[in-house]
């Protein structure tokens, strides 16, 4: 035989691997250390999900994941004596959890939620294709600042979509926004397959429209000043300023990433106010301005949801047609 280094001893498998669900979408696996592990071994546990995703080596005998339980999910766990990823772990033990039973065609589809102005969340969904028209839906939600799962009370319909909204206010000076809201929709009679979603609080945020405070002309420039929606700081927003001129029938849209009120023409030190100068505007014609805002990627993951347009404000004179 060759005189190479002795292979590292493979540890026995972990025992009592079990899985449970907390809240709506927090899946937790726990296990016990292997029986008969080598005494000079400092135990570490290697785990990954069924598709070899999210490998982890840690000393804890538990692992959790926040996941919408719309599909089966499996965790494989093994033990080893070091944190070295190249060390061969014990035989991997697997434990899976399946979504609640039911006809997949009965589950609601397009379940999505929007956090409106960081003050309330509005979720909507379509009925499953294989359900009765008289199905009564219930939406449940949970997030870290709630002690228990809550039921959403304000069910509504918008065309073919069902929806429900619930209060969800941003908590200042906390890691609140780093977390998610867990959502489940099912029917009262238990006939449909429940649907789940996880809404990160840094995405799908729709601000309220801004409020135009002042329009003024200086030479041929139009100075626009507006108040941003409550709950947002200006550096976290992008803006779109639309100017319509009644005489030339022009329609100009300006995409504004920074809207500081630095010019002396602007009213200064007004809290949560933004400003923009529109160049080359004819003062002796009627100009109508409206503004909308959206979150930006400095503060949020998502930058796709524009607010509704602000109320219009006009400045200048409408010329008499002769």
């Amino acid at each position: 035989g060759g005189g190479g280094a002795a292979p590292t001893e493979t540890q026995p498998p972990v025992t009592n691997l079990s899985v449970s669900v907390e809240n709506l979408c927090t899946v937790i696996w726990t296990w016990n250390p292997p029986e008969g592990a080598s005494s000079n071994c400092s135990l570490w546990y290697f785990s990954h999900f069924g598709d070899k995703q999210d490998k982890k080596i840690a000393p804890e005998t538990r692992r959790s994941i926040e996941v919408p339980l719309n599909e089966r999910i499996c965790l494989q766990v093994g033990s080893q004596c070091s944190t070295n990823e190249s060390e061969k772990p014990s035989i991997l033990v697997e434990k899976c959890i399946s979504p609640p039973e039911g006809d997949p065609e009965s589950a609601v589809t397009e379940l999505q939620c929007i956090w409106h102005n960081l003050s309330y969340m509005k979720c909507s969904w379509l009925p499953g294709r294989n359900t009765s028209p008289d199905t009564n839906y219930t939406l449940y939600y949970w997030h870290r600042s709630l002690e228990k799962i809550h039921q959403c009370e304000n069910i509504f319909r918008e065309g073919q979509y069902f929806g429900c909204s619930f209060d969800l206010t941003k908590v200042k000076d906390s890691s609140f926004e780093q977390h998610s809201v867990q959502i489940m929709v099912k029917d009262n009679a238990g006939k449909i397959k429940p649907s789940f979603n996880i809404v990160p609080l840094t995405s799908r945020v729709k601000p309220d429209p801004p409020h135009i405070k002042n329009l003024s002309f200086h030479n041929d420039d139009l100075y626009v000043q507006w108040e941003n929606p409550q709950n947002f700081i200006s550096r976290c927003l992008f803006y779109e300023v639309e100017v319509n001129n009644s005489q030339t029938e022009t329609h100009n849209v300006f995409y504004v990433q920074e809207a500081k009120c630095e010019n002396p023409e602007f009213e200064r030190n007004v809290e949560n106010t933004s400003c923009f100068m529109v160049p080359g505007v004819l003062p002796d014609t009627l100009n109508t301005v409206r503004i909308r805002v959206k979150t930006n990627k400095l503060c949020y993951e998502d930058d796709k949801l524009w607010s509704n347009w602000s109320q219009e404000m006009s400045i200048g004179k409408k010329r008499n047609s002769t």
């Epitope: 918008e158 065309g159 073919q160």
Partner: antibody, heavy 118, light 107 residues
Framework: EVQVLESGGGLVQPGGSLRLSCAAS????????MTWVRQAPGKGLEWVST????????YYADSVKGRFTISRDNSKNTVYLQMNSLRAEDTAVYYC???????????WGRGTLVTVSS | EIVLTQSPDFQSVTPKEKVTITCRAS??????LHWYQQKPDQSPKLLIK???QSFSGVPSRFSGSGSGTDFTLTINSLEAEDAAAYYC?????????FGQGTKLEIK
């Protein structure tokens, strides 16, 4: 008044392409699925394709899968049916219909005739 | 796929007569059955939704009944303007399916 109006039909050779449009008015377009149903000359109704209000869910009949593509532009209140690799058996009047409630068609357009022939 | 079979395929009737058209589904579809009327050279129109609910603006002589697999469209006291093809349609699951149609002729 709620209405839908199809356009874009015509004569096309086998293997050719055509794009149908359906302009809708009188309702909140993005809240409703839109469907294309066709009717071959002298025959019954055949469902072709459906797209949900926000465009996330799309469904096709087996007979057109891989050849037809449904899409919608909610800013223009319009739904489209792009038809490629057309066959003689696709010859039909194509109706656009608004879906309501639990999947019934409460508003239909007048239809646009597609003829596939060499 | 749900198959819908209508009967009769064709019916010739006189005004004021009562007409019954049946539609049988190949499997239970609850109340997810709708009836459409198509007059010559026109597009279809919704008559009855969910097996028995009249659509707005539809004359009261049209009524629907049934659930599960067997459904009926009834026209009480037929009028000349009711000459048309009538189709049942299932919306339970996909694909949507239509019956082959029943053509109603007025004598």
């Amino acid at each position: 008044e709620v209405q839908v109006l199809e356009s874009g039909g015509g004569l096309v050779q086998p293997g050719g392409s055509l794009r149908l449009s359906c302009a809708a008015s009188g309702f909140t377009f993005s809240n409703y699925a839109m469907t294309w149903v066709r009717q071959a000359p002298g025959k019954g109704l055949e469902w072709v394709s459906t797209i949900s209000g926000r465009g996330y869910s799309i469904y096709y009949a087996d007979s057109v899968k891989g050849r037809f593509t449904i899409s919608r532009d909610n800013s223009k209140n319009t739904v489209y049916l792009q038809m490629n690799s057309l066959r003689a058996e696709d010859t039909a009047v194509y109706y656009c219909a608004k879906e309501e409630g639990h999947w019934y068609f409460d508003v239909w357009g007048r239809g646009t005739l597609v003829t596939v022939s060499s | 796929e749900i198959v819908l079979t209508q009967s009769p395929d064709f019916q010739s009737v006189t005004p004021k007569e009562k007409v019954t058209i049946t539609c049988r589904a190949s499997q239970s579809i609850g109340s997810s059955l709708h009836w459409y009327q198509q007059k010559p050279d026109q597009s279809p129109k919704l008559l009855i939704k969910y097996a028995s609910q009249s659509f707005s603006g539809v004359p009261s002589r049209f009524s629907g009944s049934g659930s599960g697999t067997d459904f009926t469209l009834t026209i009480n006291s037929l009028e000349a303007e009711d000459a048309a093809a009538y189709y049942c349609a299932s919306s339970r699951g996909l694909p949507y399916t239509f019956g082959q149609g029943t053509k109603l002729e007025i004598k």
